[in-house]
């Protein structure tokens, strides 16, 4: 009758932070000799514990090995990193000069499994306009084991990556993945989102997200027309300047009088739309009685540090005595109108 | 004083299960480092040792019964118990439930039940 | 499985009488080794543990000695309540393996 080795688990799977017992049964008190605990095979197997007098530091041995009769040198190992996975062997040896393998276990394998970190997505440095494709990337890290789901989504429509990548592709601790995803820009984009969703064993079914609000990645440029009210006096003509369905928020607008600057608009009171996109519109009364020329009026505007959109109206003098009452409209947004 | 108290039916039909349990009194079943075993005496015969339960959880078995030896323990009870499947007139016998001492040896036996498999 | 041979495997003493038991393992078994006393009707008792210790309550007219494959139980001056089957049992190897008994009698 030789003395068997028994490890019941061919595996075990463990949350890090969490302990697990690796279970080991001798068929037999006989021969006298120790019994050791090693992780992997061969010269470079370390040990793992020992049932002597040596401490190991998260190892503890489940029942009293001091007890004659005692043949269960289960271990318990505490506290479990993502480096405690591994395949662990329990080993019998024959005392003597020096002490003898004679006998090890099937060997258990520990899997330890670790959460992925929530997923961060990251977009484009500078921001993109309406049609335009950008890239977005989802990266997570940290997970055991190598098995994971990540999808896209934008606006609870699924998206297919452009790739997806697991690394490292052997064997290793824990793992990290990284994803990208090319979407098309619309004007409507300013509320939406682009979410990475990342399920794996560790999550309950309860899938980790990171959300890139589009909002961060786009610019919808404004639609800036000027247009001339019916004058309220016979000394004064109303300029309006409309920019429509812009985003984001940064804007000024600068009235000019025949391409000298008139007045600065540093808006404050932007109306917002539906669609998360801004409107502003900025009046200008210009006096009558100081113009008997033409006036060329500027509109122009600057948007997110984009070269400026400019719109101009031009307002016909005094002078002009025959086109009293009329006004033009051109298709480059100049007017004309005469004073009185 | 650690006792123990075997309980269970007298009689069993041939091919059925054979379920006994063994009650512990004076001490719980969960504490020490002990081995709790089941044992059993064909009449006017020997002892034979059917198996034990480690208290750190192995469960050791005689090979000779194993593929219809069933032992576990319900520490919530303090009580363990044996179940032994298609038993034949060849499993009429004395059994008997025992606890190991601090040092090795059986040193607390229930006073044993008398199982007879007959129709 | 470890065989365990006791003998003899019935004797009968007078009272006073010095009795010996010897119990051979069919592999060396080291000192794992426990003796049990039964009387008729009753369940087994513990008499000597690890081969030469006396258990707790035991009379000492009780003994046991022996390591390896050869072992002897000894009641140094038989008493009229030594009537019983004594047993040898092994714990080296699993399973656990009880001698054949040896019945002892009063002549």
């Known amino acids: 009758t030789e003395v068997k080795v028994i490890q019941p688990e061919k595996s075990v799977s463990v949350a890090a932070g969490d302990s697990t017992v690796l279970n080991c049964t001798l068929t037999s008190l006989l021969p006298v000799g120790p019994i050791r605990w090693y992780r992997g095979v061969g010269q470079s197997r370390q040990l793992i514990y020992s049932f002597t007098t040596e401490h190991f530091p998260r190892v503890t041995n489940v029942s009293d090995a001091t007890k004659r009769s005692n043949l269960d040198f289960s271990i318990r190992i505490s506290n479990v990193t993502p480096e405690d996975a591994g395949t662990y062997y329990c080993v019998k040896f024959q005392r003597g000069s020096p002490d003898t393998e004679i006998q090890s276990g099937g060997g258990t394998e520990v899997y330890v499994l670790a959460k992925p970190s929530p997923p961060e997505v990251s977009g484009p440095a500078d921001r993109g306009i309406p049609d335009q494709k950008v890239n977005f990337t989802c990266k997570s890290h940290g997970f055991s084991p190598r098995n994971i789901t990540l999808k896209w989504f934008k606006d609870g429509q699924e998206l297919h990556p452009l790739e997806t990548t697991v690394n490292p592709s052997g064997k290793n601790v824990s793992y990290n993945i990284s994803s990208t995803v090319r979407v098309v820009l619309n004007s409507m984009d300013v509320n939406s989102k682009v979410i990475c969703e990342v399920a794996h064993i560790t999550l309950d079914r309860s899938p980790l997200r990171g959300i890139a609000n589009l909002s961060n990645f786009i610019r919808v440029s404004p639609t800036v027309k000027v247009t001339q009210q019916s004058p309220t006096s016979m000394n004064q003509v109303n300029l309006t300047c409309r920019a429509e369905r812009f985003y984001p928020e940064d804007l000024q607008l600068i009235w000019l009088e025949n391409g000298n600057v008139s007045r600065n608009d540093t808006p404050k009171n932007l109306t917002k739309n539906t669609d998360g996109t801004y409107n502003y519109t900025s009046l200008f009364l210009v006096n009558s009685s100081a113009h008997r020329e033409d006036v060329v009026f500027t509109c122009q505007v600057k948007h997110d540090q984009q070269p400026a959109i400019t719109r101009n109206h031009t307002v016909l003098g005094f002078a002009h005595s025959s086109d009293q009452g009329s006004m033009q409209t051109f298709p480059d947004n100049n007017a004309t109108h005469n004073w009185n | 004083q650690v006792q123990l108290q075997e309980s269970g039916p007298g009689l069993v039909k041939p091919s059925q299960t054979l379920s006994l349990t063994c009650t512990v009194s004076?001490?719980?079943?969960?504490?020490?480092?002990?081995?709790w075993s089941w044992i059993r005496q064909h009449p006017g015969k020997g002892l034979e040792w059917i198996g034990a339960?480690?208290?750190?959880?192995?469960?050791y078995y005689n090979p000779s019964l194993k593929s219809r030896v069933t032992i576990s323990v319900d520490t919530s009870k303090n009580q363990f118990s044996l179940k032994l499947s298609s038993v034949t007139a060849a499993d009429t016998a004395v059994y008997y439930c025992?606890?190991?001492?601090?040092?090795?040896?059986?040193?607390?036996w229930g006073q044993g039940t008398t199982v007879t498999v007959s129709s | 499985d470890i065989q365990m041979t006791q003998s003899p495997s019935s004797l009968s003493a007078s009272v006073g009488d010095r009795v010996t038991i010897t119990c051979q393992a069919s592999q060396d078994i080291s000192n794992y080794l426990n003796w049990y006393q039964q009387k008729p009707g009753k369940a087994p008792k513990l008499l000597i543990y690890d081969a030469s210790n006396l258990a707790t309550g035991v009379p000492s007219r009780f003994s046991g000695s022996g390591s390896g494959t050869d072992f002897t139980f000894t009641i140094s001056s038989l008493q009229p309540e030594d009537i019983a089957t004594y047993y040898c049992?092994?714990?080296?190897?699993?399973?656990?393996?009880f001698g054949g008994g040896t019945k002892v009698e009063i002549k």
């Open positions: 049992q092994q714990f080296a190897y699993l399973p656990w393996t």
């Open positions: 025992s606890k190991e001492g601090y040092h090795s040896g059986m040193d607390v």
């Open positions: 004076g001490g719980s079943i969960s504490s020490g480092g002990y081995y």
């Open positions: 339960i480690y208290y750190s959880g192995p469960i």
